[in-house]
């Protein structure tokens, strides 16, 4: 189920960001992958060019060089290079991060939090992270996500119910109310599909319009042809005729004055019937077998 909620969003204390290839490790840094931002006194796309301040005075580097003069660029703390809530302060040569409890490194990028610090909220279980050098992972209970299980998930927003099922997030569980013809935890099973679906007692499966039905053999009925049909249940014999179940259908024994397969035709007083002719060998009032 690729559309379902991941139970945790990764780990805290992952490796420092990978900067733009060639970015000077001594004079550049990045806040986004593939970026290269220069420390004070350095410039160029890879922060390898020392800034010359001979042409004019610049209160502070890094900068973009213009003809004959240096345009002041952002300070080393602009945009706050300190991760995880660290606070930045400028130093004569670059910057310094004051890291919150549980983080360390040049830019507070390394997590010093361990499982003993109880970083997983909302019932999350802390896995790994036995010491400050190994990162921990929070396994979050269903309904929560984030590095620390701090985010409540609207699991229905990911539309986990298939085939038009209605999603209900009960907090502790997710329910899919399936449309007619579908079943399963995510409404993934198509009950209206003939594939792998047998009709009992010699019935055949017929698909059509996104639904299936069983065309049942004579004498059987119901959704899967499992019920023995009573052909007389619907009172098919008209005008008081009596119905008899028969191995191949039903037979109507007509009341006097009526004839036909279902006793639907009155016999006229002069002996003629409403039918063009009675079937050979049959007199009015004889049982008529319904085919």
């Amino acid at each position: 189920y690729p559309y379902d909620v991941p139970d945790y969003a990764g780990m805290l204390g992952s490796a420092p960001l990978v900067c733009r290839a060639g970015c000077s490790p001594e004079h550049g840094f990045c806040e986004q992958p593939g970026e290269c931002r220069c420390l004070e006194g350095w410039t160029g796309p890879l922060c390898t060019v020392p800034v010359s301040t001979s042409s004019c005075l610049s209160p502070r580097g890094p900068s973009s060089a213009t003809t004959g003069c240096l345009v002041p660029g952002p300070g080393p703390c602009d945009g706050n290079p300190c991760a995880n809530g660290g606070s930045c302060s400028e130093t004569p040569r670059s910057f310094e991060c004051t890291c919150p409890r549980g983080f360390y490194g040049l830019r507070c990028e390394v997590s010093g939090v361990t499982c003993a610090d109880g970083p997983c909220f909302n019932g999350g279980l802390c896995v790994g992270g036995a010491d400050p050098d190994s990162a921990y992972i929070c396994h979050c209970p269903p309904g929560f996500q984030g590095s620390n299980c701090e985010k409540r998930v609207d699991r229905c927003s990911l539309q986990p119910c298939r085939n038009g099922g209605l999603c209900l997030d009960l907090g502790h569980a997710l329910r899919c109310r399936c449309r007619a013809g579908f079943a399963g935890p995510r409404c993934e099973h198509d009950l209206d599909d003939c594939a792998g679906r047998a009709c009992a007692n010699g019935g055949t499966c017929v698909e059509g319009g996104g639904a299936h039905r069983c065309s049942c053999a004579l004498g059987f009925g119901g959704r899967d042809c499992r019920e023995r049909a009573d052909p007389c249940a619907a009172r098919p014999c008209a005008h008081g005729g009596r119905c008899y179940a028969h191995f191949s259908g039903l037979v109507c024994a007509c009341a006097p004055g009526y004839m036909g397969a279902r006793c639907e035709f009155p016999v006229h007083p002069d002996g003629a019937s409403a039918l063009p002719a009675a079937p050979p060998g049959l007199r009015p009032g004889d049982p008529q077998r319904y085919l």
Partner: antibody, heavy 118, light 108 residues
Amino acid sequence: QVQLQESGPGLVKPSETLSLTCTVSDNSISNYYWSWIRQPPGKGLEWIAYIYYSGTTNYNPSLKSRVTISLDTSKNQFSLQLSSVTAADAAVYYCARVFHWGFAFDIWGQGTMVTVSS
Amino acid sequence: EIVLTQSPGTLSLSPGERATLSCRASQRVSNTYLAWYQQNPGQAPRLLIYGASSRATGIPDRFSGSGSGTDFTLTISRLEPEDFAVYYCQQYGTSPLTFGGGTKVEIK
């Protein structure tokens, strides 16, 4: 209320692999984590592993090299395999549902006794 | 791993008496993620308490839990005949999940 039922052989030979299956009585298998716990005769409880339908698993380090847990949502089942069994693995094995508010266990199967003997 | 030590190993009491069971952790149990279970002979354990002090569904109010950090207590205010059983604590703050060795509450 949902019910859990363990199934599998009650007798396993030493060095062989123990395979157990737990059947969940309703369609809630995608809503919870599911776990295996064992209890040797006359002793305490030991957690073995848990699994979530997204693929997340977690194993007790003391058993990790020998244990595999898997889940089949279409059958409403999850399974345990424990390889290279010894007499020390003889226990009542329980499957259990992980509570929705933390990794405690709120629904348990009745347990199945596994004996290891040649 | 966090080791849970339960005491006493056996508690002999009479029906109607108060039972106090202890569970001590080798290190801090984060966020009071501690549960208590009851197990009768030949049966599976039953969840009584989670989050150190919250009663699970259908558990009578004579059962109560307390504690934080490394020391936790299960109290049964008035023992009923069906309460004589083995009780286990379990921490679920840090993997691996661990159980205490159990306390048997028997009839005096």
